[in-house]
Structures are given as C-alpha cells and as structure tokens.
C-alpha cells in the first residue's frame, strides 16, 4: 500500500489551532514539478457534507513529502470530509478523514467501520442532545433510512446493513429531522472487496494474517498497518511517537501522538495512534490494553509486561507476541519484511536462525508462494546464528507474493513470512523526442512513457547512423534532463533509442522503439550581392545577383529573395530553388511601392548572410482617369461620348475602355475597347430605344488606369429593339438587357 498518512489534530478548544497534515513516505512524493512524482493534495471535500462557506483554508507545503491545512475560524469549518491524495500513477491513493462536531445532537460510537464483503455492518449513533423527532440516515448525501425517535436503544440509534458489498462503502450520517446537518453523526464505511482473510481477483488468495489490528488490502494482499506498527504482517512495534510504514515519521509536539487521529489508505480508515483512545484520542490505554484505539489486549505470559505502545515486553529467555515462545525454540532472525527483485533474475536470499539445538543447513528451508520448497546451497555458521543462502531459480511474475523461511529443530519450529515483489524492468512505449537540431548535434528529450515498473534509476540513449552496421554509441543520462548528442555528421539520419533501468540487478529493460533524427546541413557562408535590377512593368521586377568565387562545391540549395514594403509593414519572400540561378523575375508586386530588396543563399533550412540591401521604386499602376466625360443621345439607338485626355501621363496611351450598363439593371456591365487612343469621342451604337444608360471609361498604358466619373443618358424613343450596343461599327459580344 502507499505510505500515506493523514493526521488530524483534535485539540478542539480553539478551532484556529486545529490542523490537518498529510505525510507521504513515498520516494519523490509531493515534488509537483518532478515528472516522476505528482504533488500531494489536501482539501476539504464538500460534495457530501456541505458546510457554510468561510474564509479559504491555508495550505502549506513542508518539504517534498508533507502538506498542512490550517485557517479554520469556527467549529463548523471542521465538520465534514477531508481528503489527501498522494502516490504516482496506478498507486495514486486517497486517504479520507471524517470530522464530527463534539457538540452535535448525535455522535458516532465509532467513526470508521471496516468490514468484509458479505458482513453485516452496524453503525451506532449515540444521543448527545435529545430531540423528539425522527432520525434520518443518509448514505453519501442521499436519503437512506428513517427511524422513529422511540427506536433508540440504550440511547443509541442503530443502522444495520446486512450482507454489505463494496458499493455500500461511503459516508453515512444520522441526523434528527429539523436539525442542522452540522449536528449529524458522520461515519465512514469501508467494505473490503473480499470476504474475511481473502484478497485478489476472485478473492482466491489468502491474506498473510495481519497482526496488531492491521487490515489486509483486498487488491494486493499487503497489510495496512495501524499507526505505530510495521513489518509485512505488522508484527513489529515502532518506538513510541513514531509512525509510517517504516516508523520513519515522528508525531509533532511534546506529548507525542496524543490528540491526533491517524487516517491511512483504505481499507484501514482512521484510528488514534498506538497507546491512545477516545473520541479525541486524548485518553491513554487502560492497563492490559495497547495499540491503536487501545483495541488490543496484551495477555502476556511468562512474566511479560504490557506496554501500551508495543504490547508484551518479554523477559530474558522468552519471545513471541504473548512471550509464549522459549528462546530454546528456534527463531528466525532479522528477516526483511519485504524484498524486491527484477523479473528473470536469479537472486540469492539469506535466512538466519538461532536456537538450541543450533540450526544446521538442512533445517532451514525457503517456501515460494506456489508451495515449492527450496533447500539452501550453503550455510554460514557463526557462534550466535546460522545463515542459510538460497539460490533462487529465474524469477517469474507469479513469484510475487508471500515467501516463507522456516526453521525446524528438535526444540520446535519458527517461520517468518516476507513479501517478494517481482518487478518488471521498464520498457519505453514511445521513441525519444527531438527538440532541436544543428549540423553536428541533436538535442533529445529522453523522458517517455513506459510499461513495467519504476522508479527509473538510469536512462541510456543508444544512437548510430541510419542503415549502419557499426556499433551503437551509448550515453547515460539523468532521467529528468534533455540530452545533447554531440560530434555528429551533418545532413545524416540517426537511429535513436531509449533504454530504461530500474534499481537492482537485472533492472535494465529492453530497448524502446527507434526513431529517425536527421542532423541539419552546414550553414551556407557565402554572401551574395545584387548586380542590378530593372522594372519590367508596374508590378514586375527583374533582379540579378552574383556570388564570390571560392574553391570547391557550392554549399547551398537555392536563394531567398526578400522584398520589404516599409509603408505597409509587409515582407514578401521569393524562393529560387536552383543554386546556379543568378536572376529572377518578381511579379505581382504593388505598383507605386518603395521596396527594400536583398538576397541570401540557403542550405536545407539554414540561411546564409544577406546581401547588402537595395532600394527599388516601382512606377504607379496606370494612367489617371479621362477628364470631362459627356454623353449625348443621337437617336433611339445611338449615344455619343466625348472626353478629354488624362493629364500628366507617364507614357503613351495604348487604348481606352468604355463601360456600358443599363441604369438599374442587374446584368453585368459591358466593356468596349476604343483602340484609337488619339480620339476624344466615340459613338456607341445598337442601344435600345427609350432606355437609360450609365457610362464610364478609363485609359490603359502598361496597365489599366483609374475610372472616370459616371455619366447617364437615355436613348430617344419610338425605336425598335436593338441587337445590342456596338462602338462605331464593331459588334458587342452580348446585349445589355439579355
């Protein structure tokens, strides 16, 4: 189980002194920026027990593995559900604490109830302040059951839940009808996914027999030990005032764990620390009792004395939970409660024993979870103990579980169970990511998702040129940092793969999938210069350039011409894809624009130095509009147009264009060319009688100029429908009113 403890300080005389602390014993816990360890979260959960809003609570992080919640201003701030979330990935675990108001109408006899699947759970709410109204039970905030106030037994309202199943787990409350929800008794019901003493999918596996009130986890078969106990089976007591899976944490304050509630991952729930009991965990255990909530009885034999924190303290010559075992009986010594090995390794496991008569090599055996018995290959005999060494066959995943070292002599026998975790070396699921590249180096992010088990101890990056049979180059890197592969060949594809390792022998995983990363090509160094340019039209520019002569092949793929229009703040880029080209025609430019022009050589994606810039002014687009356009009807089908030439012409006019449109008509206008530019009048023929027309015109030199003003004129009446307008004698393509 995840080593996560939520501590509640229950000295409730002053809510402002109340605090909750979440402590993680996990490696890397709480380092929010670390990719291998998400942060600890500690918050009030208002989804089920809603309390009036108050000032926001203050969260303080103390180092990487502890977070504390303070800032409670009134007792009602404390009532409800608090949760701490810690652990990474699939081990992410939520620990829950339920706080009851000491002044509530109803109080829980016991807040946390951990039961097995199929059991009957009984929740008991003790009457603290009586009301003569119904009592409403809720489950996870929703109505569950009603009791008449007369149904109290011995001043308690009981809710019996027969044959409970895991979905029955949650927060239960008992409230008098018409009373404030803050006066409710709140309970937490935890239903293990299996029947008593079983765990695993289908509940086929047997629990290790957790001692001292430890609870067997229904998913992994591990004992979740009460605060103050440690070991695979919770067989070992911590020193007074200590807690955590390895007794590594210490209760704050001079009075040790007094007044603290400890909440651990499900299916344990919450309890007082070892040696304390009562609703506020402020009462020491009565004589003969010990452990969390003082739930355990010592029953010491052979002169043992009861310590309220650790249980029986045995006199010399005796050992065992109740001092029931003579030291003449053989005893397994200092066996680690948990061992970790990597898949397919062949580890050596040592098991030491003492006793009288003295254990010999053949009297110590090792039993695997599947029942296979291993005999030791050698034994080291010392004056006070015998250590047997076992060579374990190649480990498979099924070897995970509880192993047992057993010693048998004529004086009796002893055994010690310990957990073996077979871990799968990590294998990258994805290829490393290319961050940046240069001609001789690649910057790579090696951090990828992986299958198998962490933590990641080392990351190896293997690389070699693509399609090469040469040996792979290898670099060992820090898991959290980007790697620079140096001294590579330019413009070359490299196959790059990640290999991850976890701690321990055989922790190297298989190589991850390869990815192709290509180095950039060399940067072009030659600086071109602009030889010249000339305008080939109002929007066309011919540019030519040169390169300095150097020995050897030209390093470049082509040229990039850049035109900067400072007025509009726009840049135009023209790619010339031949390195041999020395001239280019730029079209589609904006007439009348002042451009800054330069050229540079490019190679792959790298640009060389730009030429010194040139400044180019393109001529305006076309001539000004014709002046004084006038229309005069000549008959029922003819209108004469007269005008004056435009002023300040940049060159000779090549033609005029007349636009003709029926006034108010929806059709497209008709354009008619006047091909004799020296003329200042023309007759438009083939028009319809009694019809109003709109006319405008423009001149053309190298491009079309601006339109003149629009004039209106109507043809005379009583004419026949015309075929369509023409200019002079040339027929138009289509009629205006078709």
């Amino acid at each position: 189980a995840v080593d996560l403890t939520l501590l509640a300080n229950l000295r409730l005389t002053d809510p402002q002194r109340f605090f909750l602390t979440c402590v993680s014993g996990e490696a890397g816990a709480g380092r929010g920026s670390d990719a291998w360890g998400p942060p600890l979260l500690l918050e009030k959960d208002d989804r089920i027990v809603r309390t009036p809003p108050g000032p926001p609570l203050r969260l303080a992080r103390n180092g990487s593995h502890q977070v504390t919640l303070r800032g409670f201003s009134k007792p009602s701030d404390l009532v409800g559900v608090f949760s701490c979330v810690g652990g990474a990935g699939a081990r992410r675990t939520r620990v829950i604490y339920v706080h009851n108001s000491p002044g509530a109408h109803l109080l829980p006899d016991k807040v946390t109830h951990t039961v097995n699947k199929g059991d009957t759970a009984v929740l008991s709410a003790r009457v603290h302040k009586e009301k003569q109204t119904d009592v409403i039970w809720k489950s996870n905030g929703s109505y569950f059951y009603t009791l008449d106030w007369h149904e109290a037994q011995d001043g308690r309202f009981l809710l019996q839940l027969p044959n409970v199943q895991p979905p029955s787990s949650g927060i239960y409350s008992a409230t008098y009808l018409e009373a404030s929800p803050l006066g409710s008794a709140f309970f937490r019901l935890i239903v293990r996914g299996c029947g008593a003493g079983r765990w695993g999918p289908g509940c086929t596996k047997e629990c290790p027999g957790c001692l001292h009130g430890g609870v067997c986890h229904d998913h992994d078969g591990e004992c979740v030990c009460p605060p103050g106990f440690t070991g695979t089976r919770c067989e070992q007591a911590c020193r007074e005032g200590r807690f955590g899976q390895s007794c590594q944490e210490q209760c704050p304050g001079i009075s040790g764990c007094r007044g603290l509630t400890f909440c651990l991952p499900d299916p344990y729930g919450c309890s007082c620390g070892s040696g304390w009991r009562g609703s506020q965990c402020q009462e020491a255990c009565a004589p003969g009792h010990f452990g969390a909530d003082c739930r355990l009885q010592c029953q010491c034999q052979n002169g043992g004395t009861c310590d309220r924190f650790s249980g029986c303290v045995c006199p010399s010559g005796w050992h065992g939970v109740h001092c029931e075992k003579s030291d003449r009986i053989p005893q397994i010594l200092n066996m680690a409660s948990e061992l970790e090995f990597n898949l397919e390794t062949m580890p050596r496991i040592n098991c030491a024993a003492a006793g009288n008569p003295f254990p010999v090599r053949g009297s110590i055996e090792l039993r695997k979870p599947d029942g296979t018995v291993l005999l030791s290959t050698k034994a080291i005999v010392e004056p006070e103990k015998t250590t047997a060494e076992f060579e374990v066959p190649r480990l498979v995943l099924a070897d995970s579980g509880f192993w047992e070292c057993r010693v048998s002599t004529s004086g009796g026998q002893d055994s010690r169970r310990f957990k073996v975790n077979v871990k799968v070396p990590p294998v990258p699921l994805a290829a490393p990511r290319l961050l940046t590249k240069q001609s001789r180096q690649l910057v790579v992010s090696p951090l990828v998702s992986f299958s198998g088990d962490g933590p990641i101890s080392t990351v190896r990056l293997h690389y070699r040129p693509q399609d090469s049979t040469m040996d792979w180059s290898t670099i060992v890197v820090d898991p959290s940092e980007n790697v620079t592969l140096m001294n590579l060949r330019p413009k070359t594809g490299y196959s790059v793969r990640v290999q991850l390792s976890r701690p321990g022998e055989g922790g190297e995983g298989a190589w991850g999938p390869p990815t192709l990363m290509t180095t950039d090509c060399p940067e072009p160094l030659l600086q071109p210069w602009l030889e010249g340019w000339h305008v080939e039209g109002t929007d066309r520019l011919r540019v030519s350039w040169s390169l300095p002569l150097v020995p050897g092949p030209l390093v470049g793929d082509g040229f990039l011409l850049r035109l900067w229009d400072g007025t509009r703040g726009q840049e135009r880029r023209e790619n010339v894809s031949s390195p041999q080209a020395r001239t280019a025609l730029l079209t589609g430019l904006t007439p009348g624009t002042h451009y800054q022009l330069d050229v540079q050589l490019y190679h792959c994606t790298l640009l060389g130095p730009a030429s010194p810039p040139a400044h180019v002014l393109l001529p305006p687009s076309g001539p000004p509009a014709p002046r004084h356009l006038h229309a005069q009807a000549l008959s029922d089908s003819e209108i004469q147009l007269t005008w004056k030439h435009p002023e300040a012409l940049p060159g000779p006019i090549s033609k005029y264009v007349v636009e003709v449109q029926v006034a108010g008509g929806a059709g497209d206008p008709l354009w008619i060319d006047v091909d004799r530019p020296e003329e200042t009048s023309t007759i438009i023929r083939g028009l319809n009688a009694s019809t109003r027309y709109l006319f405008r015109m423009r001149a053309s030199i190298q491009g079309l100029g601006d339109w003149s003003n629009t004039v209106e004129e109507s043809t005379l009446g009583n004419g026949l429908q015309a075929e369509g307008p023409v200019q002079e004698s040339r027929a138009a393509e289509e009629g205006l009113d078709q």
């Epitope: 109505y143 009603t146 008449d148 009808l177």
Partner: antibody, heavy 119, light 109 residues
C-alpha cells in the same frame, strides 16, 4: 418507475372487516416511512396511519385507533391496513403514500381503492 | 381530531396570482417546518406541490411557492392557468400524527 398500487377495497357491512394492500415497486420499499390517507366522498383528505421502515413503530388517527392496524412486509414490498369494526363513516377512497425521504411530504401516492361500509 | 383551516374557495383570472392560507396552532403549523401542499384534480390522487414549507419537488412549476408566518402557512400560485383549477390541501405534523387542511377549491375564471 416508482409506483404504489392499492387493492382490497369493496363493499362491507357495518361491523365487518377488510384488509387493504399496497404493492410498492421502483424503489427500496424497506427504507421508507409509509402512510394511509383516506377521502370520504365529496370531502377532504384525512390522515389515517403511518408506519416506520422497521415496522416497529406505528401511529394512528384518533378516529381509527383500536380498530385499524397498519403493517408491512418488506420482503414482499407490501403495505397493509387491517380494518375491523367498520362503520359507515369509514366509507372513503383509501390511498397509500410514501414519505419523501428526509421530509414529511408524501411524494408518491397510489391511485386509491374504494371502501364502502353499508348495510 | 381537528383539521387545519383553509378558505373553502379562491378564484382568479388567467395570469393573475392567488394565495391560499392554512391556519393552525403553535403545536402544528407554528412549531413544524414540515408543512406540505398537495394538488388534487377531480377523480385523481393528490400530488405533492410543496414540501418543508417552501421547497418544490423536481417537475413542479416555479409558479407555485410556499411560505410560513407564525401559525399560518401560505401557497401562492402566480400566472394562473386553466390547468390550475383543482382542490388544494395543506398538511402539517404534530408529535405523533399528520394533519390535513380542510381543502380549498381553486376556480380559474
């Protein structure tokens, strides 16, 4: 769908007995407080009796106390009203109703069954 | 066994608002936050409109609202509609029994 269905009504002589049933479906019957309410022809609603989920606690209107008995069988999801020593003034449509969880409002009603006491 | 007092009838035009009162004593309406209101159309079972003085079950129009002052509870129907024509009953609790009001017939003119 949450439903209550009354049955057992009919014509009975004064002094006679009748047992009404109310079959519940669509909800966990064993968790809810249940009521019987009646309505004489052309008159208003009159509360008759209520029973708690455990079946251990029952209450009655003064007008039926000692003559009527409310009970429930949680395994059959059924509510009962045993009516003895019937009188003409017991003639009414009898409704069973469920209490809306954590309030005293009756949120689900049956369609009613008619009891006529006449010689 | 007494009942809670309601007006025998109340009428109003479509779109108008009407209020029905329900008067009891300090031991029922005055001392109980569990006043309910029911609507009953002819030949049909009653239907819960308001519970716990002023709460509406889901599916009940927000044109119906409840309140309480002293020993009197009130039901207000705003924006009166033709379908609101029905009998209306209040209900309250005592320590051991449940009381209904005398009933009010609402007519939409």
């Amino acid at each position: 769908e949450v439903q209550l269905l009354e049955s057992g009504g009919g014509l009975v002589q004064p002094g006679g007995s009748l047992r009404l049933s109310c079959a519940a479906s669509g909800f966990t019957f064993s968790r809810y407080v249940m009521h019987w309410v009646r309505q004489a022809p052309g008159k208003g609603l009159e509360w008759v009796s209520r029973i708690y989920p455990s079946g251990g606690w029952t209450y009655y209107a003064d007008s039926v106390k000692g003559r009527f008995t409310i009970s429930r069988d949680n395994s059959k999801n059924t509510l009962y009203l045993q009516m003895n020593s019937l009188r003409a003034e017991d003639t009414a449509v009898y409704y069973c109703a469920r209490v809306a969880g954590e309030s005293n409002g009756m949120d689900v009603w049956g369609q009613g069954t008619t009891v006529t006491v006449s010689s | 066994q007494y009942e809670l007092t309601q007006p025998a009838s109340v009428s109003g035009s479509p779109g108008q608002s009407i209020t029905i009162s329900c008067t009891g004593t300090s031991s029922d309406v005055g001392g109980c936050n569990y006043v309910s209101w029911y609507q009953q159309h002819p030949g049909k079972a009653p239907q819960l409109l308001i519970y716990d003085v002023s709460y509406r079950p889901s599916g009940v129009s927000n044109r119906f609202s409840g309140s309480k002052s002293g020993n009197t509870a009130s039901l207000t129907i705003s924006g009166l509609q033709a379908d609101d024509e029905a009998d209306y009953y209040c209900s309250s609790c005592t320590s051991s029994s449940t009381l209904f009001g005398t009933g009010t017939k609402v007519t939409v003119l």
